[in-house]
């Protein structure tokens, strides 16, 4: 047993048929010595009495809201979660495999730039009595320190018949140095609360690696005299990391028809400008990826060809 | 050439030689869907290598005041890697493919550690791996964590030499 | 054509030194490990030790230790094996091989010690 | 030291046959693992490597299996050219070291 927050314990319990459990001995926070009666949640039969209780815990119907008490006064609360072990193995029930960019992913981060600031987030189908807590550090061993805000409801999708919710937290690392080579992974952990279920998730990751540029902006089509060829032209994006000649983008460009059958045609640049052939109905679209480091390319920016 | 006296190297061949071993360190190992071994326990070989790092003045205002600092931290990591990839870690087996670009990789980080620091001059401290014989069910994990590792450290040294050659060349 | 051209038979007597050599032609020496081989009359095969000819990096069988020298030529590209304070026990075929897995052996040297 | 153990010592056989050569690691070496063909008075010949990667320029009746510490050569119809004696081989760590050898001789 350890506590996760004040008057918050968390049992952690081999899960498996028939399964002894744990014992756990609770201690009523109070100077007082006799006439203490305990309870569980709602209920008003009297569990023990006396300053401890002990308690066998082997299944949810142990866990909940245990309060001493002494003449009809509240003296404490212990709130006790359970955390299940299946096979060596901690139970991930609520949140969702993403499988993406492998299996067993339930944590997504990604950085718009080298500031250290980073997104992440996670899917559930789980609507109700749900609680989150995000910490953050560059490190384990000796951690270095890295803020996260408070993880909210940032999506809700129809998904068949179920509803999935995502969720997200924005994290800061405190003394982020953009030009250095990473040499320690940053580390995320999510405390998942569910009703009386704990489970905690984990993510290691360098920023050079969650890196995905914000599209390109300000993209524009100058038609060239006598041709079918345009200018096409293109700024960095304003999330991006300065200076440009040191952080520098490299770019896709890709003239595709309306048919997704068509063939497209595609051009890298370091540039921001290219020049390509405008087809009928086709569309233009830029992305970006830093120059020097293959990470995640930016989502499209298009515009028509007409 | 960045001479350890302190005249500014060639910031145009250094960018140009440095975005090919970008190139080169990523064909030699392209990220396989995320194949993460940070976990798959921290041999030395990996752990030892040189990190560029903050205080090291390799930033773009580091470079303005004085960028002999970041210059020679980025020699010593040349040599390091170079280094590496003559070890029988890279030459021993599993033996790589003939066209494999790690050769290459191997000339272009000799070429340009001498672009940097031409025969005869010489940086005082050198940070050379330790390296005791591999054994060769280890070697694919080392020589991905190697390259993994490379490829960090060649991106911040081609963000080096293109903000040089724009901004500090002659 | 990858070749591995080792030097002719040694007839030496006990206690005497003697170095063999085994020269690479047709790929880049330093590319690969150079591995020796030694197999006495009518028995098997037994690993010596390699050596890295990029760096002169050397791994020796602990059996091998002090007895055998492994060192390279670059300028030549050639692997050379010295066996020292020789005794009858020495004598055998030494093969030079490249990396295993590349199947390129030597023809073989043949070492008598004798009296 | 990892030994190698082969099995049979000698394998007698009549040409056309199938033939299994066994070798045994004395603990796991995953598949590195190599088999080498020595004909007498000539140098080895790598035949398979990985436990199961065929060789350019080795006939197609040869092939390996196996993983972990048990490994076969298999020869798929015995030629009287493959007469000589077979070696397996730890290539997986330190010292390298070689099965004593099957002899395959022709009937």
């Known amino acids: 047993i350890w506590e996760l927050k004040k008057d918050v314990y968390v049992v952690e319990l081999d899960w498996y048929p028939d399964a002894p459990g744990e014992m756990v001995v609770l201690t009523c926070d109070t100077p007082e010595e006799d006439g203490i009666t305990w309870t569980l949640d709602q209920s008003s039969e009297v569990l023990g009495s006396g300053k401890t209780l002990t308690i066998q815990v082997k299944e949810f119907g142990d866990a909940g809201q245990y309060t001493c008490h002494k003449g009809g006064e509240v003296l404490s609360h212990s709130l006790l979660l359970l955390h299940k072990k299946e096979d060596g193995i901690w139970s991930t029930d609520i949140l969702k495999d993403q499988k993406e960019p492998k299996n067993k992913t339930f944590l997504r981060c990604e950085a718009k730039n080298y500031s250290g600031r980073f997104t992440c987030w996670w899917l559930t189908t789980i609507s109700t009595d749900l609680t989150f807590s995000v910490k953050s550090s560059r490190g384990s061993s000796d951690p270095q320190g890295v803020t996260c805000g408070a993880a909210t409801l940032s999506a809700e999708r129809v998904r068949g018949d179920n509803k999935e919710y995502e969720y997200s937290v924005e994290c800061q690392e405190d003394s982020a140095c953009p030009a250095a080579e990473e040499s320690l992974p940053i580390e995320v952990m999510v405390d998942a609360v569910h009703k009386l279920k704990y489970e905690n998730y984990t993510s290691s990751f360098f920023i050079r690696d969650i890196i995905k540029p914000d599209p390109p902006k300000n993209l524009q089509l100058k038609p060239l005299k006598n041709s079918r060829q345009v200018e096409v032209s293109w700024e960095y994006p304003d999330t991006w990391s300065t200076p440009h000649s040191y952080f520098s983008l490299t770019f896709c460009v890709q003239v595709q028809g309306k048919s997704k059958r068509e063939k497209k045609d595609r051009v890298f640049t370091d540039k921001t400008s290219a020049t390509v052939i405008c087809r009928k109905n086709a569309s233009i679209s830029v992305r970006a990826q830093d120059r020097y480091y293959s990470s995640s390319w930016s989502e499209w920016a298009s515009v028509p060809c007409s | 050439r960045a001479v350890p006296g302190g005249s500014s190297p060639a910031w145009t061949q250094c960018q140009q030689l440095s975005q090919k071993l970008c190139t080169l360190a990523w064909s030699a190992h392209p990220l396989v869907g995320h194949m993460d071994l940070r976990e798959e326990g921290d041999e030395e070989t990996t752990n030892d290598v040189p990190h560029i790092q903050c205080g090291d003045g390799c930033d773009p205002q580091g470079l303005r005041d004085n960028s002999q600092f970041c210059l020679q931290r980025i020699h010593q990591g040349l040599i390091f890697y170079e280094k590496l990839l003559g070890s029988d870690i890279f030459t021993g087996e599993p033996s790589l493919l003939p066209d494999s670009p790690v050769g290459q990789l191997h000339a272009s980080l000799l070429g340009l550690s001498q672009l940097l620091q031409p025969e005869g001059h010489h940086w005082e401290t050198q940070q050379i791996p330790s390296l005791s014989p591999s054994q060769p069910w280890q070697r694919l994990l080392l020589r991905f964590k190697i390259l993994r590792s490379l490829q960090a450290f060649v991106a911040v040294a081609a963000r080096v030499f293109a903000h040089g050659a724009a901004t500090l060349s002659p | 054509e990858v070749q591995l051209q080792q030097s002719g038979p040694e007839l030496v007597k006990p206690g005497a030194s003697v170095k063999m050599s085994c020269k690479a032609s047709?790929?880049?020496?330093?590319?690969?490990?150079m591995h020796w081989v030694k197999q006495k009359p009518g028995q098997g095969l037994e690993w010596i030790g390699y050596?890295?000819?990029?760096?002169?990096?050397?791994n020796y069988n602990e059996k091998f230790k002090g007895k055998a020298t492994l060192t390279s030529d670059k300028s030549s590209s050639t692997a050379y094996m010295e066996l020292s304070s020789l005794t009858s026990e020495d004598s055998a075929v030494y093969y030079c091989t490249k990396n295993w897995d590349k199947g390129y052996w030597g023809q073989g040297t043949t070492l008598t010690v004798s009296s | 030291d990892i030994v190698m153990t082969q099995s049979p010592a000698t394998l007698s056989v009549t040409p056309g046959d199938r033939v299994s050569l066994s070798c045994r690691a004395s603990?796991?070496?995953?598949?590195?693992l190599h088999w080498y063909q020595q004909k007498s008075h000539e140098s080895p010949r790598l035949l398979i490597k990985y436990a199961s990667q065929s060789i350019s320029g080795i006939p197609s009746r040869f092939s390996g299996s196996g993983s972990g510490s048990e490994f076969t050569l298999s020869i798929n119809s015995v030629e009287p050219e493959d007469v000589g004696v077979y070696y397996c081989?730890?290539?997986?760590?330190?010292?390298?070291?070689f099965g004593s050898g099957t002899k395959l001789e022709i009937k």
């Open positions: 081989q730890n290539g997986h760590s330190f010292p390298f070291t």
């Open positions: 047709g790929y880049t020496f330093t590319t690969y490990l």
């Open positions: 050596i890295n000819p990029y760096n002169d990096g050397t």
């Open positions: 603990q796991s070496i995953s598949d590195y």
